[in-house]
Interface confidence: medium
């Protein structure tokens, strides 16, 4: 392969000028012609000077993985993913988060002492005996005597839960 300058790429035994960011090579240079560059189409990008024949596919930020788009894809830069509100990162890929995990929710028999935010995990607190939280999302535990449909069951101190009767 020929030793090409930084702004060139090898084609056979010759060197051709690279295309700029946001463009890919449509046709390599010839004896009398320069490199023919073509813009990347929407949904694709190239961030650097290059000799690529195709633009790269923009990454998708999959909400099912707890991801949201923190920077939209442009023809010169890939999309960046971050964690959705209520999630924290569990796997990093390069400079972005590749997978996130939802903040813990309180269990039945606990109340939400402090709700989860982007920068704060959910803080849970056991319900006092004689009270319940049906799904772990209530900020206040309810008294077992207030609703005849619930029967408070004790699984130990501060672990009041419920069952249907």
């Amino acid at each position: 392969l020929p030793s090409c300058k930084e702004d060139e790429y090898p084609v056979g035994s010759e060197c051709c000028p690279k295309c700029g960011p946001g463009f890919h090579v449509r046709q390599a240079c010839g004896e009398q012609t320069g490199t023919v560059c073509e813009p990347c189409s929407p949904g694709t990008y190239i961030a650097h000077f290059n000799g690529l024949s195709k633009c790269l596919q923009c990454q998708m930020c999959d909400p099912a993985m707890g991801l949201r788009t923190s920077r939209n894809c442009s023809t010169t830069a890939n999309a960046l993913c971050g964690c959705s509100p209520g999630h924290f990162c569990i796997i990093q890929d390069g400079d972005h988060c590749a997978a996130c995990r939802a903040y813990a929710t309180s269990s039945p028999g606990q109340r939400v002492q402090k709700g989860g935010t982007e920068s704060q995990d959910t803080l849970c607190q056991n319900c006092p005996p004689g009270t319940f939280s049906s799904n772990g999302t209530l900020e206040e535990c309810q008294h077992g005597t207030k609703c005849s449909k619930w029967l408070v069951t004790e699984a130990g101190p501060g672990t009041s839960s419920f069952r249907w009767v």
């Epitope: 924290f88 988060c97 997978a99 704060q120």
Partner: antibody
């Protein structure tokens, strides 16, 4: 580069407390991620013990909840494991991890009198 | 807690052979993750979120599955692949499978 290093006594007596430290370099434990303790028993079974989230809140394996505590020292970029009332069944290699992607090399702990 | 069952417990393969390791969950999980562990070292993330290759992992590794059944395939086994492989879920409390040991014939 992110690195995690476990440290602590290799031998603990039954009924005592096991205390381990994970020292993190190359990443702030308050920036993001859950910081886990995971152990591997002889025979290679892996068990998640608990984590402390970058925000400071914790989540524990229900089977250990009554005797585990995970805390941290943000000024030293360290987090800690304390396991009370240990028995021979707590003999294992203990790993600290950042989320799922970075693990320490592990430290072996034997519980024996 | 979600129990993960891996099979087979041990698999013996020749160089260049394709092998598939499976992981069954006691209830449905959103994603499965896979680790490789060689003797005397800590587990290394191999595949995350069912089918995504972790950084630096060779393309001969692939993952698939959904719900309660997931698999890890090595398209052409190489000598360096001899190791223990663990599936792992974080849909509820973190749990791991008991592992599959890949041996070379």
């Amino acid at each position: 580069d992110v690195q995690l290093q476990e440290s602590g006594p290799g031998l603990v007596k039954p009924s005592q407390s096991l205390s381990l430290t994970c020292t993190v370099t190359g990443y702030s434990i308050t920036s993001d991620f859950a910081w886990n303790w995971i152990r591997q028993f002889p025979g290679n079974k892996l068990e998640w013990m608990g984590y402390i989230v970058y925000s400071g809140s914790t989540s524990y394996n229900p089977s250990l909840k009554s005797r585990i505590s995970i805390t941290r020292d943000t000024s030293k970029n360290q987090f800690f494991l304390q396991l009370n009332s240990v028995t021979a069944e707590d003999t294992a290699t203990y790993f600290c991890t950042r989320g799922m992607d970075y693990w320490g090399q592990g430290t072996s702990v034997t519980v024996s009198s | 807690q979600i129990v993960l069952t891996q099979s087979p417990a041990i698999i013996s393969a020749s160089l260049g052979e394709e092998v598939t390791l499976t992981c069954s969950a006691s209830s449905s999980v959103s994603y499965m993750h896979w680790y490789q562990q060689k003797s005397g070292t800590s587990p290394k993330l191999l595949i995350y979120s069912t089918s995504n290759l972790a950084s630096g992992v060779p393309s001969r590794f692939s993952g698939s599955g959904s719900g309660t059944f997931y698999s890890l395939t090595i398209s052409s086994v190489e000598a360096e692949d001899a190791a223990d492989y663990y599936c792992h879920q974080w849909s509820s409390y973190l749990t791991f499978g008991a592992g599959t040991k890949l041996e070379l014939k």
